[in-house]
Interface confidence: low
Amino acid sequence: TPEVWVQVQMEATELSSFTVHCGFLGPGSISLVTVSWGGPDGAGGTKLAVLHPELGTRQWAPARQARWETQSSISLALEDSGASSPFANTTFCCKFASFPEGSWESCGSLPPSSDPGLSAPPTPVPILRAD
Protein backbone atom coordinates (compact mmCIF):
# COMPACT_ATOMS: atom_id res chain seq x y z
CA THR A 1 0.00 0.00 0.00
CA PRO A 2 1.39 3.42 -0.91
CA GLU A 3 2.28 5.75 1.93
CA VAL A 4 3.11 9.42 2.30
CA TRP A 5 5.58 10.69 4.86
CA VAL A 6 5.88 14.24 6.14
CA GLN A 7 8.72 15.91 8.04
CA VAL A 8 8.72 19.45 9.38
CA GLN A 9 11.93 21.06 10.52
CA MET A 10 13.01 24.39 11.88
CA GLU A 11 16.24 25.75 10.48
CA ALA A 12 18.96 25.94 13.11
CA THR A 13 20.40 29.16 11.72
CA GLU A 14 17.12 30.94 11.08
CA LEU A 15 14.44 30.34 13.69
CA SER A 16 11.80 31.99 11.52
CA SER A 17 12.45 29.55 8.66
CA PHE A 18 10.79 26.17 8.39
CA THR A 19 11.03 23.45 5.79
CA VAL A 20 8.44 20.81 5.04
CA HIS A 21 9.70 17.60 3.43
CA CYS A 22 7.26 15.11 1.92
CA GLY A 23 7.71 11.86 0.11
CA PHE A 24 5.72 9.14 -1.57
CA LEU A 25 6.48 5.50 -0.86
CA GLY A 26 4.94 3.28 -3.47
CA PRO A 27 4.87 2.34 -7.13
CA GLY A 28 3.59 4.51 -9.91
CA SER A 29 4.54 7.95 -11.18
CA ILE A 30 3.67 11.20 -9.39
CA SER A 31 1.35 13.47 -11.39
CA LEU A 32 0.84 16.21 -8.80
CA VAL A 33 1.83 17.17 -5.26
CA THR A 34 -0.20 19.59 -3.17
CA VAL A 35 1.07 21.00 0.12
CA SER A 36 -1.33 22.68 2.50
CA TRP A 37 -1.36 23.90 6.08
CA GLY A 38 -4.02 23.89 8.76
CA GLY A 39 -5.46 20.65 7.45
CA PRO A 40 -5.89 18.67 4.24
CA ASP A 41 -6.32 20.59 0.99
CA GLY A 42 -9.97 21.32 0.34
CA ALA A 43 -10.96 20.24 3.86
CA GLY A 44 -10.10 23.25 5.97
CA GLY A 45 -6.51 23.53 4.83
CA THR A 46 -4.96 26.39 2.89
CA LYS A 47 -2.93 25.51 -0.16
CA LEU A 48 0.75 26.45 0.08
CA ALA A 49 2.17 24.90 -3.07
CA VAL A 50 1.36 22.77 -6.09
CA LEU A 51 4.18 20.89 -7.83
CA HIS A 52 3.79 19.28 -11.23
CA PRO A 53 6.66 17.26 -12.72
CA GLU A 54 6.34 18.92 -16.12
CA LEU A 55 4.33 22.10 -15.69
CA GLY A 56 6.42 23.35 -12.82
CA THR A 57 5.54 24.65 -9.39
CA ARG A 58 3.42 27.38 -7.90
CA GLN A 59 3.50 28.55 -4.32
CA TRP A 60 1.52 30.91 -2.15
CA ALA A 61 2.85 33.13 0.63
CA PRO A 62 4.19 32.40 3.18
CA ALA A 63 5.76 29.59 1.13
CA ARG A 64 9.13 30.74 -0.18
CA GLN A 65 10.38 27.93 -2.41
CA ALA A 66 8.90 24.62 -3.49
CA ARG A 67 11.13 22.11 -5.24
CA TRP A 68 11.49 18.47 -6.12
CA GLU A 69 14.16 16.63 -4.11
CA THR A 70 13.72 13.32 -5.93
CA GLN A 71 11.14 11.96 -8.35
CA SER A 72 8.97 11.06 -5.38
CA SER A 73 9.80 13.67 -2.73
CA ILE A 74 9.57 17.43 -2.42
CA SER A 75 10.57 20.20 -0.03
CA LEU A 76 8.86 23.47 0.75
CA ALA A 77 10.64 26.35 2.46
CA LEU A 78 8.48 28.68 4.54
CA GLU A 79 9.14 32.13 5.96
CA ASP A 80 7.50 32.77 9.33
CA SER A 81 6.54 36.43 9.43
CA GLY A 82 5.85 36.39 13.17
CA ALA A 83 2.87 35.79 15.40
CA SER A 84 0.44 35.75 12.48
CA SER A 85 1.84 32.45 11.21
CA PRO A 86 2.92 30.25 14.14
CA PHE A 87 4.33 27.37 12.13
CA ALA A 88 5.48 25.58 15.25
CA ASN A 89 1.87 24.77 16.09
CA THR A 90 0.68 24.16 12.56
CA THR A 91 -0.18 20.96 10.76
CA PHE A 92 1.21 20.57 7.25
CA CYS A 93 -0.30 18.12 4.80
CA CYS A 94 1.07 16.68 1.58
CA LYS A 95 -1.10 15.04 -1.04
CA PHE A 96 0.50 12.97 -3.77
CA ALA A 97 -1.53 12.11 -6.85
CA SER A 98 -0.02 9.14 -8.61
CA PHE A 99 -1.02 6.98 -11.52
CA PRO A 100 -2.61 4.48 -11.23
CA GLU A 101 -2.88 4.40 -7.44
CA GLY A 102 -4.86 7.61 -6.93
CA SER A 103 -4.30 10.27 -4.27
CA TRP A 104 -2.64 9.74 -0.91
CA GLU A 105 -2.28 12.34 1.80
CA SER A 106 -0.53 12.58 5.12
CA CYS A 107 0.02 15.34 7.65
CA GLY A 108 2.73 16.24 10.14
CA SER A 109 3.90 19.04 12.37
CA LEU A 110 6.91 20.18 14.33
CA PRO A 111 6.96 18.45 17.73
CA PRO A 112 6.46 21.00 20.55
CA SER A 113 9.70 19.96 22.21
CA SER A 114 11.86 19.94 19.11
CA ASP A 115 15.08 21.94 19.11
CA PRO A 116 16.12 24.05 16.13
CA GLY A 117 17.53 21.87 13.42
CA LEU A 118 15.71 18.76 14.54
CA SER A 119 13.00 17.37 12.33
CA ALA A 120 9.79 15.66 13.17
CA PRO A 121 9.82 11.92 12.63
CA PRO A 122 8.20 10.74 9.44
CA THR A 123 4.47 10.24 9.63
CA PRO A 124 4.11 6.65 8.49
CA VAL A 125 0.34 6.34 8.32
CA PRO A 126 -1.48 8.38 5.69
CA ILE A 127 -4.84 9.94 6.26
CA LEU A 128 -7.36 7.42 4.99
CA ARG A 129 -8.08 9.38 1.88
CA ALA A 130 -7.54 7.65 -1.42
CA ASP A 131 -9.43 9.47 -4.15
Epitope: A43, V50, H52, W60, A61
Partner: antibody, heavy 129, light 107 residues
Framework: QVQLQESGPGLVKPSQTLSLTCTVS??????????WSWIRQHPGKGLEWIGY???????SYNPSLKSRVTISVDTSKNQFSLKLSSVTAADTAVYYC?????????????????????WGQGTTVTVSS | EIVMTQSPATLSVSPGERATLSCRAS??????LAWYQQKPGQAPRLLIY???TRATGIPDRFSGSGSGTEFTLTISSLQSEDFAVYYC?????????FGQGTKVEIK
Protein backbone atom coordinates in the same frame (compact mmCIF):
# COMPACT_ATOMS: atom_id res chain seq x y z
CA GLN B 1 -20.34 28.46 -21.78
CA VAL B 2 -20.96 28.25 -18.04
CA GLN B 3 -23.63 30.55 -16.64
CA LEU B 4 -24.78 31.16 -13.08
CA GLN B 5 -28.22 32.28 -11.95
CA GLU B 6 -29.15 33.30 -8.40
CA SER B 7 -32.68 32.83 -7.12
CA GLY B 8 -34.50 33.37 -3.85
CA PRO B 9 -36.76 35.80 -2.00
CA GLY B 10 -35.97 39.48 -2.36
CA LEU B 11 -37.39 40.35 1.05
CA VAL B 12 -36.53 38.69 4.34
CA LYS B 13 -37.72 39.66 7.82
CA PRO B 14 -35.20 40.45 10.57
CA SER B 15 -34.08 37.43 12.64
CA GLN B 16 -35.15 35.05 9.88
CA THR B 17 -32.92 32.98 7.59
CA LEU B 18 -31.94 34.21 4.15
CA SER B 19 -31.91 31.39 1.58
CA LEU B 20 -30.52 31.69 -1.93
CA THR B 21 -29.77 29.16 -4.64
CA CYS B 22 -27.32 29.38 -7.52
CA THR B 23 -28.07 27.24 -10.56
CA VAL B 24 -25.15 26.34 -12.80
CA SER B 25 -25.81 25.77 -16.50
CA UNK B 26 -23.43 24.90 -19.31
CA UNK B 27 -21.16 22.88 -17.05
CA UNK B 28 -21.22 20.42 -14.19
CA UNK B 29 -20.44 21.31 -10.58
CA UNK B 30 -19.31 17.75 -9.98
CA UNK B 31 -16.61 17.90 -12.66
CA UNK B 32 -14.36 19.45 -10.01
CA UNK B 33 -11.61 21.97 -10.41
CA UNK B 34 -13.64 24.90 -9.10
CA UNK B 35 -14.68 26.53 -5.87
CA TRP B 36 -18.27 27.79 -5.99
CA SER B 37 -18.49 31.02 -4.05
CA TRP B 38 -20.97 33.50 -2.66
CA ILE B 39 -20.10 37.19 -2.54
CA ARG B 40 -22.23 40.12 -1.44
CA GLN B 41 -22.19 43.85 -2.00
CA HIS B 42 -23.85 46.27 0.36
CA PRO B 43 -25.60 49.26 -1.28
CA GLY B 44 -22.98 51.63 -2.67
CA LYS B 45 -20.18 49.61 -1.07
CA GLY B 46 -17.46 47.14 -1.98
CA LEU B 47 -17.46 43.37 -2.34
CA GLU B 48 -17.42 40.90 0.55
CA TRP B 49 -16.59 37.23 0.07
CA ILE B 50 -18.99 35.05 2.07
CA GLY B 51 -17.65 31.56 1.46
CA TYR B 52 -17.23 28.72 -0.98
CA UNK B 53 -18.15 25.10 -1.42
CA UNK B 54 -16.30 22.45 -3.37
CA UNK B 55 -18.27 19.79 -5.25
CA UNK B 56 -17.23 17.28 -2.59
CA UNK B 57 -19.00 19.36 0.07
CA UNK B 58 -15.88 20.95 1.58
CA UNK B 59 -16.56 24.51 2.65
CA SER B 60 -14.72 27.61 3.79
CA TYR B 61 -16.44 30.65 5.26
CA ASN B 62 -15.50 34.24 5.97
CA PRO B 63 -14.72 34.34 9.71
CA SER B 64 -16.87 37.46 10.08
CA LEU B 65 -19.96 35.51 9.00
CA LYS B 66 -19.00 31.94 9.86
CA SER B 67 -21.38 31.53 12.80
CA ARG B 68 -24.39 32.37 10.61
CA VAL B 69 -23.49 30.89 7.22
CA THR B 70 -24.16 27.51 5.68
CA ILE B 71 -23.31 26.73 2.06
CA SER B 72 -24.45 23.43 0.59
CA VAL B 73 -24.32 21.74 -2.79
CA ASP B 74 -26.76 19.55 -4.71
CA THR B 75 -24.83 18.01 -7.57
CA SER B 76 -27.91 16.21 -8.89
CA LYS B 77 -29.56 19.59 -9.53
CA ASN B 78 -26.28 21.31 -10.40
CA GLN B 79 -26.96 23.90 -7.70
CA PHE B 80 -25.31 25.31 -4.63
CA SER B 81 -27.08 27.26 -1.92
CA LEU B 82 -26.51 29.89 0.73
CA LYS B 83 -28.25 30.14 4.08
CA LEU B 84 -27.61 33.13 6.34
CA SER B 85 -29.35 32.98 9.69
CA SER B 86 -30.45 35.68 12.13
CA VAL B 87 -30.39 38.39 9.50
CA THR B 88 -30.53 42.10 10.27
CA ALA B 89 -30.77 45.21 8.13
CA ALA B 90 -26.98 45.06 7.81
CA ASP B 91 -27.41 41.97 5.62
CA THR B 92 -29.29 43.96 3.00
CA ALA B 93 -27.14 43.60 -0.13
CA VAL B 94 -26.84 42.30 -3.65
CA TYR B 95 -25.79 38.65 -3.41
CA TYR B 96 -23.69 37.11 -6.18
CA CYS B 97 -22.65 33.55 -6.84
CA UNK B 98 -19.39 33.01 -8.70
CA UNK B 99 -16.98 30.36 -9.89
CA UNK B 100 -13.49 30.50 -8.42
CA UNK B 101 -10.83 28.58 -10.34
CA UNK B 102 -8.54 25.92 -8.97
CA UNK B 103 -6.41 23.29 -10.64
CA UNK B 104 -8.12 20.56 -12.62
CA UNK B 105 -8.50 17.62 -10.28
CA UNK B 106 -9.58 15.32 -13.08
CA UNK B 107 -6.37 15.52 -15.07
CA UNK B 108 -4.19 16.56 -12.16
CA UNK B 109 -2.92 19.44 -14.27
CA UNK B 110 -2.91 22.86 -12.67
CA UNK B 111 -4.72 25.70 -14.36
CA UNK B 112 -2.71 28.75 -13.49
CA UNK B 113 -5.73 30.97 -14.07
CA UNK B 114 -7.08 31.90 -10.70
CA UNK B 115 -9.83 34.42 -10.06
CA UNK B 116 -13.60 34.51 -10.11
CA UNK B 117 -14.16 34.22 -13.83
CA UNK B 118 -17.90 33.57 -14.00
CA TRP B 119 -20.52 35.48 -11.99
CA GLY B 120 -24.27 35.44 -11.69
CA GLN B 121 -26.07 38.69 -12.39
CA GLY B 122 -26.78 39.14 -8.68
CA THR B 123 -29.98 39.21 -6.66
CA THR B 124 -31.00 41.98 -4.30
CA VAL B 125 -32.04 40.93 -0.82
CA THR B 126 -33.64 43.44 1.52
CA VAL B 127 -34.00 42.71 5.22
CA SER B 128 -36.99 44.56 6.56
CA SER B 129 -40.09 43.94 8.60
CA GLU C 1 -7.35 38.26 7.21
CA ILE C 2 -5.46 40.15 4.53
CA VAL C 3 -6.63 43.73 4.16
CA MET C 4 -6.56 45.19 0.65
CA THR C 5 -6.33 48.97 0.30
CA GLN C 6 -6.92 50.75 -3.00
CA SER C 7 -5.98 54.27 -4.00
CA PRO C 8 -7.18 56.68 -5.05
CA ALA C 9 -10.86 56.31 -4.16
CA THR C 10 -11.80 58.27 -7.28
CA LEU C 11 -9.73 58.91 -10.38
CA SER C 12 -10.80 61.55 -12.92
CA VAL C 13 -9.33 60.90 -16.34
CA SER C 14 -10.04 62.15 -19.84
CA PRO C 15 -10.79 59.64 -22.61
CA GLY C 16 -7.59 58.54 -24.35
CA GLU C 17 -5.46 59.21 -21.27
CA ARG C 18 -3.68 56.68 -19.11
CA ALA C 19 -5.14 55.59 -15.77
CA THR C 20 -3.05 54.08 -12.98
CA LEU C 21 -4.78 52.38 -10.04
CA SER C 22 -2.98 51.12 -6.96
CA CYS C 23 -3.69 48.25 -4.59
CA ARG C 24 -1.78 47.42 -1.42
CA ALA C 25 -2.01 44.21 0.61
CA SER C 26 -1.47 44.17 4.38
CA UNK C 27 0.86 41.17 3.92
CA UNK C 28 2.42 39.39 0.99
CA UNK C 29 0.05 37.71 -1.43
CA UNK C 30 2.87 36.65 -3.77
CA UNK C 31 1.49 37.33 -7.26
CA UNK C 32 -1.98 36.05 -6.44
CA LEU C 33 -3.93 39.20 -7.19
CA ALA C 34 -6.93 39.76 -9.44
CA TRP C 35 -8.57 42.91 -10.77
CA TYR C 36 -12.27 43.26 -11.52
CA GLN C 37 -14.31 45.88 -13.34
CA GLN C 38 -17.85 46.68 -12.26
CA LYS C 39 -20.35 48.89 -14.01
CA PRO C 40 -23.59 50.12 -12.40
CA GLY C 41 -26.20 47.38 -12.13
CA GLN C 42 -23.82 44.70 -13.34
CA ALA C 43 -21.80 41.92 -11.74
CA PRO C 44 -18.03 42.36 -11.50
CA ARG C 45 -16.01 41.14 -14.49
CA LEU C 46 -12.61 39.51 -14.13
CA LEU C 47 -9.93 41.55 -15.92
CA ILE C 48 -6.59 40.35 -14.59
CA TYR C 49 -5.55 37.34 -12.52
CA UNK C 50 -2.24 36.17 -11.10
CA UNK C 51 -1.16 39.83 -11.00
CA UNK C 52 -0.58 40.32 -14.72
CA THR C 53 -2.48 37.79 -16.84
CA ARG C 54 -5.43 39.13 -18.77
CA ALA C 55 -8.64 37.09 -18.59
CA THR C 56 -10.22 35.84 -21.79
CA GLY C 57 -11.47 38.63 -24.03
CA ILE C 58 -9.87 41.48 -22.08
CA PRO C 59 -8.21 44.07 -24.38
CA ASP C 60 -4.49 44.63 -24.08
CA ARG C 61 -4.90 48.23 -22.91
CA PHE C 62 -5.43 46.66 -19.48
CA SER C 63 -2.25 45.53 -17.74
CA GLY C 64 -1.33 44.50 -14.22
CA SER C 65 1.98 44.60 -12.42
CA GLY C 66 3.49 44.28 -8.99
CA SER C 67 4.25 41.51 -6.53
CA GLY C 68 4.14 40.89 -2.82
CA THR C 69 2.17 43.77 -1.34
CA GLU C 70 2.12 46.48 -4.03
CA PHE C 71 0.13 46.15 -7.24
CA THR C 72 -0.90 48.40 -10.09
CA LEU C 73 -3.60 48.22 -12.74
CA THR C 74 -2.87 50.39 -15.78
CA ILE C 75 -5.35 51.29 -18.49
CA SER C 76 -3.15 52.67 -21.25
CA SER C 77 -5.75 54.65 -23.17
CA LEU C 78 -9.15 55.02 -21.57
CA GLN C 79 -12.15 54.24 -23.73
CA SER C 80 -15.69 55.36 -22.92
CA GLU C 81 -16.61 51.83 -21.82
CA ASP C 82 -13.77 51.77 -19.27
CA PHE C 83 -15.35 54.26 -16.90
CA ALA C 84 -16.38 52.05 -14.01
CA VAL C 85 -15.36 50.91 -10.53
CA TYR C 86 -12.30 48.67 -10.26
CA TYR C 87 -11.64 46.23 -7.43
CA CYS C 88 -8.51 44.30 -6.54
CA UNK C 89 -8.82 40.93 -4.82
CA UNK C 90 -6.22 38.65 -3.33
CA UNK C 91 -6.51 34.95 -4.09
CA UNK C 92 -3.56 33.87 -1.99
CA UNK C 93 -5.44 33.10 1.21
CA UNK C 94 -8.88 32.40 2.56
CA UNK C 95 -10.89 34.40 3.21
CA UNK C 96 -10.73 36.03 -0.22
CA UNK C 97 -10.63 39.77 0.36
CA PHE C 98 -11.31 42.72 -1.91
CA GLY C 99 -10.16 46.30 -1.93
CA GLN C 100 -12.76 49.01 -1.37
CA GLY C 101 -12.68 49.98 -5.05
CA THR C 102 -11.47 52.84 -7.24
CA LYS C 103 -14.01 54.72 -9.30
CA VAL C 104 -12.66 55.86 -12.66
CA GLU C 105 -14.77 58.76 -13.87
CA ILE C 106 -14.73 61.06 -16.88
CA LYS C 107 -12.77 64.26 -16.33
Amino acid sequence: QVQLQESGPGLVKPSQTLSLTCTVSGGSISSGGYYWSWIRQHPGKGLEWIGYIYYSGSTSYNPSLKSRVTISVDTSKNQFSLKLSSVTAADTAVYYCARDLDYDILTGYPRWDYGMDVWGQGTTVTVSS
Amino acid sequence: EIVMTQSPATLSVSPGERATLSCRASQSVSNNLAWYQQKPGQAPRLLIYSESTRATGIPDRFSGSGSGTEFTLTISSLQSEDFAVYYCQQHNNWPRTFGQGTKVEIK
